[in-house]
């Protein structure tokens, strides 16, 4: 007789989710002179260890923090760019700007990028046909609590002045419901951030509205300056413009405004 | 989601090159290989090639060898194929289609398309 | 003459089962892993099977594969008419350093 299988709302583990996570390592660190030293085995014996055999809705920080040790990096502090709901251009904008980083530019944030997974309380399996959905089934699931983790840390890093890419065309540019407003702006330390720099991503073409003011950025505003933290703003009218004045910066079309 | 969102259809004329286009969007590009596959008209699938985005490298089938180039463009998540010297036989159309995690294509040959373009119709013809 | 090579055609009976043969060679299918693909009428295809016998979140369990040193099966059961469409076998080829089709199987639900 089968087993009887919880059946979750959100899709299952991807596939190949243990090769893929050791490939990963293994490429990372080959590519990353300071992350030479890790022991990729190690990572995926405990990456594996903080989800499997425990119940997919009971997930807690503390089942990651050996894999959190072993992938402790240092990246440059006043390099890091924050992204909510525009992640293709953030990594198409860390592609071109080499000098900066997205969380999934670290060894921790590539592993998992793009991929899900979760186990089965009291069995070592895992479960590729369904994992707990964030809003159907329950927050503390595997992959949110990775998220929300390495995300925390990676706002406790940052120094000096932090960048964020917001998505303009969205009806809350800035949600305090993404792992942006409710986790890494809240461990971005202000003894070491001097400034927040927002730039908010224009969608439509003809749209030259000035977003800075949206009643949700005025919202991040304030959250920022009560946390002793300054705050900027800029539109980026033209994303297709900007990446090419990032890549060609003496363009002389680069220096109206984008 | 994952999406991947092709160029539209094409009309050229023997001899002429094609230059046909695929937006990713819903993940990280450089992460996934990409692949091209033909369909001619009432045929089978055709696996023409494949391009790593992270650093462009790519593999042809021996048959488009030399007629068929894919570059892509990490700034706009785009993978291109070009085909030259186009003959009536090319006429079909063009799947552009998500292959395996590139890491692990370093190590393994994995070759399923997880993820399709919703095909590009190009036609030959004089 | 392709390198891998399917049935032309299969037909079954709602709630039935089907089975759709696959065969090569071992520079294909006996040394690589086997994927099988469902293209309905006017469509893109779409992943059925991967690594020979696993199914991607959100194929139904009636969807099964197999593989047996040079050949490999993709099995269907209770068949239902939306199961009308053509079904690829792909493999890589070593000797070939490419990818392969099978040249796709016509199911019909009668």
């Known amino acids: 007789v089968p087993r009887w299988r919880q059946q979750w709302s959100g899709p299952g583990t991807t596939k190949r989710f243990p090769e893929t996570v050791l490939a990963r390592c293994v490429k990372y660190t080959e590519i990353h002179p300071e992350m030479r030293h890790v022991d990729c085995q190690s990572v995926w014996d405990a990456f594996k260890g903080a989800f499997i055999s425990k119940h997919p809705c009971n997930i807690t920080e503390e089942d990651y923090q050996p894999l959190m040790k072993l992938g402790t990096q240092t990246v440059p502090c006043n390099k890091i760019l924050l992204w909510s709901r525009i992640k293709d251009l953030a990594h198409q904008f860390t592609q071109v700007q080499r000098d900066m980083f997205t969380l999934e530019d670290t060894l921790l944030g590539y592993l998992a990028d793009d991929l899900t997974w979760c186990g089965e309380f009291n069995t070592s399996k895992i479960n590729y046909q369904s994992c707990p959905d964030w809003r159907k089934d329950c927050s503390n699931n595997p992959v949110s609590v990775f998220w929300k983790t390495v995300s925390r840390r990676f706002a406790e890093a940052a120094c000096d002045v932090v960048h964020v890419m917001l998505n303009g065309s969205r009806s809350k540019i800035f949600d305090k419901n993404s792992t942006f407003g409710s986790v890494e702006v809240h461990n971005l330390q202000p003894e070491k951030v001097q400034t927040l720099e927002a730039w908010v991503i224009h969608g439509g073409r003809e749209d030259s509205r000035d977003l800075c003011q949206d009643p949700t950025i005025k919202e991040l505003e304030s959250i920022i300056s009560k946390r002793n933290i300054q705050f900027s703003c800029k539109n980026i009218y033209r994303p297709d413009k900007f990446l090419q004045c990032v890549k060609n910066p003496e363009d002389s079309s680069c220096t109206s405004e984008i | 989601q994952v999406q991947l969102v092709e160029s539209g259809a094409e009309v050229k004329k023997p001899g002429a090159s094609v230059k046909v286009s695929c937006r990713a969007s819903g993940y990280t590009f450089t992460n996934y290989h990409l692949h091209w596959v033909r369909q001619a008209p009432g045929q089978g699938l055709e696996w023409v090639g494949t391009?790593?985005?992270?650093?462009?490298?790519?593999t042809y089938a021996q048959k488009f060898q030399g007629r068929v180039a894919m570059t892509s463009d990490t700034s706009t998540s785009t993978v291109y194929m070009e085909v030259n010297r186009l003959r009536s036989d090319d006429t079909a159309v063009y799947f552009c289609a998500r292959g395996s995690d590139n890491a692990l294509a370093d190590f393994y040959n994995y070759y399923d398309m997880d993820v399709w373009g919703q095909g590009t119709t190009v036609t030959v013809s004089s | 003459q392709a390198v891998v090579t399917q049935p032309p055609s299969v037909s079954a009976a709602p709630g039935q089962k089907v089975t759709i043969s696959c065969s090569g060679s071992?520079?294909?299918?006996?040394?690589?892993?086997v994927s099988w693909y469902q293209q309905l009428p006017g469509t893109a295809p779409k992943l059925l099977i991967y690594d020979n016998n696993e199914r991607p979140s959100g194929i139904p369990g009636r969807f099964s594969g197999s593989k047996s040193g040079t050949s490999a099966t993709l099995g269907i059961t209770g068949l239902q008419t939306g199961d009308e469409a053509d079904y690829y076998c792909?493999?890589?080829?070593?000797?070939?350093?490419?990818?392969?089709f099978g040249g796709g199987t016509k199911l019909t639900v009668l």
């Open positions: 792909g493999t890589w080829d070593s000797s070939l350093s490419a990818g392969v």
């Open positions: 391009i790593n985005p992270r650093g462009g490298s790519t």
């Open positions: 071992s520079s294909n299918i006996g040394n690589n892993y």
